[in-house]
């Protein structure tokens, strides 16, 4: 079961994916593809980075975060219903059977049609917090809460740091489909 992310038609969608570089600027190739992660590489590649830079991208797909620090979260601009589906973020760690694979499910909802407001509305009601904004980042990872509630952003941020700990094993088994490849 893939972790699910939602956005509305016309919005930008945000799909989180992180890794920890061995050292600043010591990057690992990453690919993003439409469809579940296959055995190797990514299918239907929409964006790819190498050891230095983003070396392939298609229109509307970009990295908004600092990929040089391991934030390879994908932003999809101005989404349509056709953007719904599973996306694969693959951290291509050198050597065989090392890749970290994350399958993320994007659900696009039709845009809400609302009548023109007759009075000032509450800001948070007019602009509900969407998953297209940044989720929990590394600074918040100490407040884990109960395991089933941890989102993929937290898990993927923590995956390497907690590699050998019992908590990491619990995280991997928590149903968030983290996959060591």
């Amino acid at each position: 079961s893939e972790v699910e992310y939602r956005a509305e038609v016309g919005q930008n969608a945000y799909l989180p994916c992180f890794y920890t570089p061995a050292a600043p600027g010591n990057l690992v190739p990453v690919c993003w593809g439409k469809g579940a992660c296959p055995v190797f590489e990514c299918g239907n590649v929409v964006l790819r980075t190498d050891e230095r830079d983003v070396n392939y991208w298609t229109s509307r797909y970009w990295l908004n975060g600092d990929f040089r620090k391991g934030d390879v979260s994908l932003t999809i601009e101005n989404v349509t219903l056709a953007d719904s589906g599973i996306y694969c973020c693959r951290i291509q760690i050198p050597g065989i059977m090392n890749d970290e694979k994350f399958n993320l499910k994007l659900v696009i909802k039709p845009a809400k049609v609302t009548p023109a407001p007759t009075r000032q509305r509450d800001f948070t009601a007019a602009f509900p917090r969407m998953l297209t904004t940044r989720g929990h980042g590394p600074a918040e990872t100490q407040t884990l809460g109960s395991l089933p509630d941890i989102n993929l952003t937290q898990i993927s941020t923590l995956a390497n740091e907690l590699r050998d700990s019992r908590l990491a094993n619990d995280l991997r088994d928590s149903g968030a489909t983290i996959r060591i490849g």
Epitope: P94, A168, N169, I180
Partner: antibody
Framework: EVQLVQSGAEVKKPGESLKISCKGS????????MQWVRQMPGKGLEWMGA????????RYTQNFKGQVTISADKSISTAYLQWSSLKASDTAMYYC?????????????????WGQGTTVTVSS | DIQMTQSPSSLSASVGDRVTITCKAS??????VSWYQQKPGKAPKLLIY???NRYTGVPSRFSGSGSGTDFTLTISSLQPEDFATYYC????????FGQGTKLEIK
């Protein structure tokens, strides 16, 4: 304590089927690749293939593709190696071994824990 | 497949000797090389990984070196329990092993 316990020795006739097992304990079974390695009598080690029980990803080396089937049952933390039709040349010791993968920070990629081995003898 | 060629295939030595076993990869494998020790009737045991890192609990007399295609395992002072067969293995691509070096008592 990490342990891999394999099923007992088997004596079979050519053409028979066989399924041997490897039960992992003391670690998160779904978070590590489980590998199978063959050692024919008096010979060296040959990697056969592997399974990642977390999502069922399976890899085979070319020599063993179509010859054996690797599977796993997450619910009982057990990996399997099976043959549908054994040959005399399948006579060997078969080991399961846990694979420690690399991360972006640490290079690993090694077999860190091994089962005790299952001897398979195929003879008419 | 990447071939790993180990030499010598057998070696006689005495307790206290310094012993070196070499392994050559058919193509560049970086430092994705491990060394294993196997005693008769037993499963292999990991000694060295990443070409030069000693695995937990392995005595300091065991050391590994090399990168690219040429690798060595050195036992600085042989102990009685070190007489066994040693295998190198690469894990840059699907794992392959050398044919083994049998270390015997002289």
């Amino acid at each position: 304590e990490v342990q891999l316990v394999q099923s007992g020795a088997e004596v079979k006739k050519p053409g028979e089927s066989l399924k041997i097992s490897c039960k992992g304990s003391g670690y998160s079974f779904t978070s590590y690749w489980m590998q199978w390695v063959r050692q024919m009598p008096g010979k060296g080690l040959e990697w056969m293939g592997a399974i990642y029980p977390g999502d069922g990803d399976i890899r085979y080396t070319q020599n063993f593709k179509g010859q054996v089937t690797i599977s796993a049952d997450k619910s009982i933390s057990t990996a399997y190696l099976q043959w549908s039709s054994l040959k005399a040349s399948d006579t060997a010791m078969y080991y399961c071994a846990r694979w420690e993968k690399s991360t972006t920070v640490v290079q690993r990629n090694y077999f860190d824990y091994w089962g005790q081995g299952t001897t398979v003898t195929v003879s008419s | 497949d990447i071939q790993m060629t180990q030499s010598p295939s057998s070696l006689s030595a005495s307790v206290g000797d310094r012993v070196t076993i070499t392994c050559k990869a058919s193509e560049n494998v970086g430092t994705f090389v491990s060394w294993y020790q196997q005693k008769p009737g037993k499963a292999p045991k990991l000694l060295i990984y990443g070409a030069s890192n000693r695995y937990t609990g392995v005595p300091s007399r065991f050391s590994g070196s090399g990168s690219g295609t040429d690798f060595t395992l050195t036992i600085s002072s042989l102990q009685p329990e070190d007489f066994a067969t040693y295998y190198c293995g690469q894990s840059y691509s699907y794992p392959t092993f050398g044919q083994g070096t049998k270390l015997e008592i002289k």
